[in-house]
Interface confidence: low
């Protein structure tokens, strides 16, 4: 044991130090005192600390701890906050482009529908955006509303244009006929399936990122218990009471204290690991019809095909609907007019060819890789904090909470603490209520993520057989059903450099005219320009 340093006969250094924490010297003894009222820095001899000083040290220690914790989580917090914002904005851009593609398709192929179609398309994609952000909207209802709204316009503008104004009150009948007669074939059901799958996954992805932020924010702003404050004070400040201003705590001692203080927080570790791994599974399954980018950007083509389907059956439909909706009171009898011989196009829809150069998919995978480097974040916190606060290297000539020691011994330190308070008790108290709440939220999101990802991402599948798909049709299990039929197959050149062009918007009025094909230009859409990445931190 090294000899103790000569005591500071005047408490001058302690006074000088303490004045920085608390202006005024009224609490600091001028010379060492017995310190019998001390509760944390229990003196082995005369001390330069008072009870009031102890209280100030405890406050300061807890503040330091809170700031260390915030510092520890800063990089992780920034990563998730930035990505949540970037993905949310990128998804909005996908929606905006999808809307513009669809509007361009109407403008180029069905200009007589455009004023109203633009309105319905706008409402549909607004609902898509709201759904992604968590709004309580039913995807099937969104799709039904789109086609319910479109059909009366198609009928009055394209199928029976000569209707007098007085016949416009047949809109309700036409909306009903749209469903009963399945005038768009199975395309609405196909869109429902694709859109609901891709949007549900997108929505849960954003929810998971936002919960990640909440987890970090919760642990970032934890208020540490008084017991923890006492342990921290003993570790960081009690040495000053003995005039040992330059002595640093032993590293091993710091680890013991941090494990005590952080016991509740470290309980998050198991659920945090599961969160990152579940998020990775979800991301791995986000392709084809589980990728909203892929689905929404091909939607204009499927809608075009659905209108072509109406077109092919227009003759029979006009006759049937003419009878059905001639007087709106006949509406209740409409099922009697169900046409048995509508033309059913059983040609297999071709896949919209997607060239992935740099898509949201690669961004998602990049985020997961970065998040995985933080998989041990919570279990590593005590060690991180010790390595980022003043500790003695190699545990030599360091402070063990009671005295300056040549070498730290965990056993001796624990024994020395027994009469002051029990570390074990501190650990056994269980996590703070806020930590328990965040663990419950993590459990819930992990359950949701697992549900979405397993088995093989097919949990969301619905059986569409009863809807009339036959072999050769585009059934639900065929992930490829994204758009383009016959010779009008769409080639989507998907160079999504979203982060480079967050302000970019396709103006429908600029779309080149082409009344024959589904696509605005030469059977190919490539409105995404490589403008270079603006948001380089994600690279």
């Amino acid at each position: 044991q090294p000899p103790p340093p000569p005591p500071d006969a005047t408490c001058h250094q302690v006074r000088s130090f303490f004045q920085r924490l608390q202006p005024g010297l009224k609490w600091v003894p001028e010379t060492p005192v017995p310190g019998s009222d001390l509760q944390v820095c229990l003196p082995k001899g005369p001390t330069c600390c008072s009870r009031k000083m102890e209280e100030k040290y405890q406050l300061t220690a807890r503040l330091n701890m809170e700031q260390l914790l915030q510092s520890a989580s800063m990089e992780l917090k920034f990563l998730i906050i930035q990505n949540a914002a970037v993905f949310q904005e990128a998804f909005e851009i996908v929606v905006r482009h999808a809307k513009n593609y669809t509007n361009a398709m109407f403008k180029n192929n069905y200009p007589s529908l455009t004023p109203q179609a633009f309105e319905f398309v706008g409402e549909f994609f607004t609902d898509v955006s709201l759904y992604i952000l968590g709004s309580d909207i039913n995807v099937d209802d969104m799709v039904n509303e789109l086609f319910d709204s479109l059909f009366p316009v198609i009928y009055t503008q394209l199928m029976n244009p000569g209707l007098p104004d007085s016949a416009l009150d047949i809109n309700e009948c036409l909306r009903g006929a749209r469903r009963d007669l399945k005038v768009f074939g199975n395309f609405p059901k196909l869109i429902m399936t694709q859109v609901s799958k891709s949007l549900q996954v997108t929505r849960i992805f954003l929810q998971a990122l936002n919960l990640g932020i909440e987890v970090i924010n919760t642990t970032d702003h934890l208020k540490f218990s008084k017991d923890c404050g006492r342990m921290l004070t003993r570790m960081w400040y009690c040495s000053y009471c003995q005039g040992l201003m330059m002595v640093k705590p032993c590293g091993g001692y710091c680890n013991v204290v941090m494990q005590g203080c952080m016991a509740g927080v470290v309980e998050i570790d198991k659920y945090w690991r599961e969160y990152i791994l579940s998020l990775e599974e979800l991301v791995n399954g986000m392709y084809r019809i589980y990728d909203m980018e892929n689905v929404l950007l091909g939607l204009f083509s499927t809608i075009h095909d659905s209108i072509q389907y109406v077109q092919k059956n227009a003759g029979k439909l006009t006759t049937t609907i003419g009878k059905l909706c001639a007087h709106s009171q006949q509406r209740q009898y409409r099922s009697a007019y169900y046409p048995e011989d509508l033309f059913i196009d059983k040609k297999v829809l071709k896949v919209a060819h997607v060239e992935h150069e740099e898509t949201l998919s690669s961004r998602r995978r990049e985020l997961i890789q970065k998040l995985k480097s933080f998989i041990s974040f919570y279990s590593a916190l005590p060690g991180y904090i010790c390595s980022h606060s003043p500790v003695a290297e190699n545990d030599t000539l360091c402070w063990n909470g009671q005295e300056l020691v040549e070498r730290y011994s965990q056993k001796a330190a624990r024994n020395g603490m027994k009469n002051q308070f029990n570390l074990h008790e501190l650990k056994m108290k269980g996590p703070e209520p806020v930590v328990s709440q965040i663990i419950d939220k993590l459990k819930h999101i992990n359950q949701l993520l697992r549900t979405m990802s397993m088995p093989k991402g097919r949990v969301l599948d619905k059986n569409l057989d009863e809807e009339g798909f036959e072999s050769g049709d585009c059934g639900d299990d065929e992930d490829e059903c994204i758009g383009g039929s016959g010779d009008g197959m769409i080639k989507v050149k998907n160079q999504l450099r979203f982060l480079a062009e967050l302000a970019y918007d396709l103006d429908v009025d600029d779309a080149p005219g082409n009344s024959q094909q589904a696509t605005p230009k030469d059977n190919e859409i490539s409105t995404f320009h490589n403008l270079g990445n603006v948001h380089s931190p994600l690279k």
């Epitope: 503040l63 700031q67 260390l68 915030q70 510092s71 330059m246 980022h388």
Partner: nanobody, 124 residues
């Protein structure tokens, strides 16, 4: 190992201004508190100002409050001390220091890395 390099010192007339800079390298600058200290000839080194890791909190010695402003640019790994209304008693060697504490403490024992110092001379 952390390196701190001060610059911006010099000779200035009373009432004038100077801006000191301290460029840091060697560890994640944005995680750590930073401070400025000064030492006049024949006197002990004293605290001048400190700033927390995020820049959200600043602290000043009473003698410089209202005249000096500490700031940081985490993107540039640099901390600054803007000194206005300088007085002859501000003459000293000014040291930049980096602390393991994110808060930017006020006492030099809580700083573990120091720059070489830059001379500030205020003439009357």
């Amino acid at each position: 190992q952390v390196q701190l390099q001060e610059s911006g010192g010099g000779l200035v007339q009373a009432g004038g201004s100077l801006r000191l800079s301290c460029a840091a390298s060697g560890r994640t600058f944005s995680s750590y508190g930073m401070g400025w200290f000064r030492q006049a000839p024949g006197k002990e080194r004293e605290f001048v100002a400190a700033i927390s890791w995020s820049g959200g909190s600043t602290y000043y010695a009473d003698s410089v409050k209202g005249r000096f402003t500490i700031s940081r640019d985490n993107a540039k790994n640099t901390v600054y001390l803007q000194m206005n209304s300088l007085k002859p008693e501000d003459t000293a060697v000014y040291y930049c220091a980096s602390s393991a504490w994110p808060a930017g403490p006020k006492h030099q024992v809580e700083y573990d890395y120091w720059g070489q110092g830059t001379q500030v001379t205020v003439s009357s």
